[in-house]
Interface confidence: medium
């Protein structure tokens, strides 16, 4: 009679993470008598996966009933596969011996490869806000996928970005991999409503890529433009001066009025109006009692936006006396200057 052979017909098996792997193994003879064991890896460091004779292997089930006398099918199923299960599995026939069974013959091995989906990409932006025309970096990370081949793309509002660096780690062989990418994005004043998208495509996703997003509203700071104007005189001795604060983001803004360098009033932007591009406008006004001033008045609108150094715009009120009339009249001249 021919000597027993252990046949593992599948050189390789590819299984998705979470699924069950079937590892096939048959013997060509019932002789010699003795158990079958399954190992992952070869040599002294091999890992026992299943022992027909003894032990508890909760994830392993046999395909056929190994208690039947004439059984020669030693195939097993391993449940709930993870990337850590990848490796080469050997079906090994032992011969009954005393006191221990003796290894008789091994199959050629079946390489188990695990396909694991990447985790949802996580996109993170810079810790501090930046202003338009500046370049900021966004990172995208996804983990736990296998095999290594993966495609990552960056988009800003649907337009693909090209300025990015991507690493897949580790560089060598591993049971699963991580991807890390850094993209550079130039901010514009219109980016309050913009989104940066990181898209990851992998064989396990069957053409339906995963996306991670970041809103540029969390990254951008659009500094305000200021305009100080004098409104028509309400009463004979009063002038209404307004400060238009336009196109700023985020909303956090504090405005201080100064008369000849002295603080007159401080207020916080509350009832703002929103522009189509997501920036805000706000107006503050100051009623100046001209009769209280003998000399020209320098009015300054000083704005502190989002904790940044204050910007200001000034307006000179020319105060001149007309002897024909009682009290003092005003001639106002807008000599606004931008001061930082």
């Amino acid at each position: 009679e021919e000597e027993l052979q252990v046949i593992q017909p599948d050189k390789s098996v590819l299984v998705a993470a979470g699924e069950t792997a079937t590892l096939r193994c048959t013997a060509t003879s019932l002789i010699p008598v003795g158990p079958i064991q399954w190992f992952r890896g070869a040599g002294p460091g091999r890992e026992l996966i299943y022992n027909q004779k003894e032990g508890h292997f909760p994830r392993v089930t046999t395909v056929s009933d190994l208690t039947k006398r004439n059984n020669m099918d030693f195939s097993i199923r391993i449940g709930n596969i993870t990337p850590a299960d990848a490796g080469t599995y050997y079906c090994v026939k032992f011969r009954k011996g005393s006191p221990d069974d003796v290894e008789f013959k091994s199959g050629a091995g079946t390489e188990l490869s695990v396909r694991a989906k990447p985790s949802a990409p996580v996109v993170s932006g810079p810790a501090a806000r930046a202003t338009p025309q500046h370049t900021v970096s966004f990172t995208c990370e996804s983990h736990g996928f296998s095999p290594r081949d993966i495609t990552l793309k960056w988009f800003k509002n649907g337009n693909e970005l090209s300025d990015f660096q991507t690493n897949v780690d580790p560089v060598g062989e591993s049971v699963s991999y991580s991807i890390h990418s850094t993209a550079k994005v130039v901010l514009t004043r219109e980016d309050v409503h913009s989104q940066v998208i990181c898209e990851v495509a992998h064989v396990t996703l069957q053409g339906d890529p995963l996306r991670g997003t970041a809103n540029l509203s969390e990254t951008i700071r659009v500094p305000p433009t200021l305009e100080v104007t004098q409104q028509p005189v309400r009463a004979e001795n009063q002038v209404n001066v307004t400060c238009q604060v336009r196109k700023f983001y985020p909303q956090r803004l504090q405005l201080t009025w100064l008369e000849n360098g002295n603080v007159s009033r401080t207020e916080t932007a509350s009832t703002v109006t929103e522009n189509k591009d997501g920036t805000y406008n706000w107006m503050s006004w100051l009623l100046v009692n001209v009769s209280a001033h003998r000399d020209d008045v320098k009015l300054t609108c000083q704005v502190e936006h989002d904790g940044q150094p204050a910007v200001s715009k000034s307006h000179d009120l020319k105060v001149s006396a007309h002897p024909k009339e009682q009290g003092s009249n005003t001639a106002a001249e807008n000599t606004g200057s931008n001061e930082r």
Epitope: N167, D169, P170, V171, G172, E173, S174
Partner: antibody, heavy 119, light 107 residues
Framework: QVQLVQSGAEVKKPGASVKVSCKAS????????MHWVRQVPGQGLEWMGW????????KYSQKFQGRVTITRDTSATTAYMELSSLRSEDTAVYYC????????????WGKGTTVTVSS | DIQVTQSPSSLSASVGDRVTITCRAS??????LNWYQQKPGKAPKLLIH???SLQNGVPSRFSGSGSGTDFSLTINSLQPEDFATYYC?????????FGGGTKVEIK
């Protein structure tokens, strides 16, 4: 035995290019990566990039991107490293080293090629 | 990029001493860490790969350990030929990076 033989020392002027060769023998050339590492006098080791000799895949260190070109000729079992726009700070010993495909360690090194950049 | 910090930068020891050099990675690199020895005017020589695997032909007085971010190279019973500079190198992520080196000098 496994050996990496590098080309001889070079003296270059700033702005010029240098091309260093690394001839491999004693093993299957296409089964490994070839790394290029440099060492400025009195300083540590600095990885420049690698080429997988089998499929030609290349990875450069961002520091040298745009200035370094790594190639290989499988029939000649030789790897090449070209560095352009040379400056005085590029004066260094340039090593090629055979790389493992799993842990990416460098187990066999060439003797090094001294490149001097001077006007 | 992963930074690799080696310490100490230099040490003085005598023949027969037990010497330990440490290497710390700025993020977890599993066991993708290798150790090299370099003597003046010579190319580096691989001692240990995969954190703890001794390279063929390297004396058993050299040993490596660690995983994640902290690693060490130990030389048991320092020999005259061991006075050299030692470098660790992470091979987890590109750009591959080396530690700054540790010079082992004769006391």
């Amino acid at each position: 035995q496994v050996q990496l033989v590098q080309s001889g020392a070079e003296v270059k002027k700033p702005g010029a290019s240098v091309k260093v060769s690394c001839k491999a023998s004693g093993y299957t050339f296409t089964s490994n990566a070839m790394h290029w590492v440099r060492q400025v006098p009195g300083q540590g080791l600095e990885w420049m990039g690698w080429i997988k000799a089998g499929n030609g895949e290349i990875k450069y260190s961002q520091k040298f991107q745009g200035r370094v070109t790594i190639t290989r000729d499988t029939s000649a079992t030789t790897a090449y490293m070209e560095l352009s726009s040379l400056r005085s700070e590029d004066t260094a010993v340039y090593y090629c080293a055979r790389g493992d495909y799993y842990y990416y360690y460098m187990d066999v090194w060439g003797k090094g090629t001294t490149v001097t950049v001077s006007s | 990029d992963i930074q690799v910090t080696q310490s100490p930068s230099s040490l003085s020891a005598s023949v027969g001493d037990r010497v330990t050099i440490t290497c710390r990675a700025s993020q977890s690199i599993s066991d993708f860490l290798n150790w090299y020895q370099q003597k003046p005017g010579k190319a580096p020589k691989l001692l240990i790969h995969a954190a703890s695997s001794l390279q063929n032909g390297v004396p058993s007085r050299f040993s490596g350990s660690g995983s994640g971010t902290d690693f060490s190279l130990t030389i048991n019973s320092l020999q005259p030929e061991d006075f050299a500079t030692y470098y660790c190198q992470q091979s987890y992520s590109t750009p591959l990076s080396f530690g700054g080196g540790t010079k082992v000098e004769i006391k």
